[in-house]
């Protein structure tokens, strides 16, 4: 009897959905395996008698509700099927977004840009999919614990008056109010800001 | 939301012509990736041709060389040119759209696409 294999998952980020596995203990010899997805009532190979442990499923629909399923395989035998469902436009999980960010005198100038789609040639972004995107950001003085956020309503937003020759940490990420679904945040960037330009009367 | 909207199914002789339209609204057109699949009476769904947002385009080995599939972006309508059609054409002809889509997959398949009309019958008689 073939073992199935273990561990079975969707590890999607940004609608790139990689199936992933681990391969059971088997005395015999090595394991090979099979993954499948449903279309329209009939299962469908997607990867073929493969000795890895993953599987590539971005091509199916970011809306539909897809059923797939991996078995473990050995010469003429072959475990049961593991199946599990998902639905990308729901589960994938959203990467961290872009940030350009610009430090004039006690202001920080900060630009979003959406995470890309994976794997689409054109230039398609998590913002498309999602109707509700905005983003989340937070902010600190660095070495300090207390964190500020704000909700820009566009693309770019001005933290201003800040405290002069201070570093700030800042980081975003992408928010999906109708879902109530965040985003992973950004790697901190962070600036020092220089003089407070207002001149004396 | 997408909505699309099969039309131009019918009956016609063996050897004749038929042009099939979807017409699409919602989301930004130019991003869909489109595909007419069909099904018959008894059998599984099938596809029969496919075009990108970046008009490449892809066809099933039975209609090769009978069947065009194009689009016209700016009246969101996608067509399938039929001619010489055989009595095995026989099926209810369905429009499909997955949006924010480009070329990178080469979709063919039922479940690649997530949004579907509800179908254009064409009878094909000898």
């Known amino acids: 009897m073939v073992p199935p294999p273990e561990n079975v998952r969707m590890n999607s980020v940004n609608f790139k959905n990689i199936l992933q596995w681990e391969s059971p203990a088997f005395a015999k010899g090595n394991l090979t395996f099979t993954a499948q997805y449903l279309s329209y009532r009939i299962f469908q190979d997607k990867c073929m008698n493969t000795t890895l442990t993953e599987c590539d499923f971005s091509s199916l629909s970011k809306y539909g509700d897809h059923t797939l399923r991996v078995r473990a395989e050995f010469a003429d035998e072959h475990s049961d099927w593991v199946n599990i469902t998902f639905c990308p436009v729901d589960d994938t999980i959203i990467g961290p977004p872009g940030m350009q960010v610009e430090v004039l005198a006690d202001s920080l100038h900060m630009r979003f840009l959406a995470p890309k789609i994976e794997n689409e040639y054109e230039t398609w972004t998590m913002k498309n999919v999602y109707n509700s995107w905005t983003y989340n950001v937070q902010y600190w003085k660095n070495g300090t614990d207390e964190k500020f956020q704000i909700t820009p309503q566009y693309d770019f937003e001005v933290l201003r008056n800040l405290e002069p020759w201070t570093t700030y940490c800042v980081q975003v990420r992408g928010f999906l109010p109708d879902r109530n679904k965040a985003g992973e945040w950004s790697e901190p960037v962070c600036e020092q800001t220089t003089h407070d330009e207002t001149v004396p009367s | 939301q997408v909505q699309l909207q099969e039309s131009g199914g019918g009956s016609v002789q063996a050897g004749g012509s038929l042009r099939l339209s979807c017409a699409a609204s919602?989301?930004?057109?130019?991003?869909?990736?489109m595909g007419w699949f069909r099904q018959a009476p008894g059998k599984e769904r099938e596809g029969v041709a496919a075009?990108?947002?970046?008009?490449?385009?892809r066809y099933a080995d039975s209609v090769k060389g009978r069947f065009t599939i194009s689009k016209d972006n700016a009246k969101k309508i996608l067509y399938l040119q039929m001619n010489s059609l055989k009595v095995e054409d026989t099926a209810m002809y369905y429009c499909?759209?997955?949006?924010?889509?480009?070329?990178?997959?080469?979709?063919?398949?039922?479940?690649?696409?997530?949004?579907w009309g509800q179908g254009t019958q064409v009878t094909v008689s000898s």
């Open positions: 499909a759209a997955e949006p924010y889509c480009s070329g990178g997959y080469k979709r063919t398949m039922v479940a690649e696409f997530g949004f």
């Open positions: 919602g989301y930004t057109y130019s991003s869909y990736c």
């Open positions: 075009i990108d947002s970046d008009g490449s385009t």
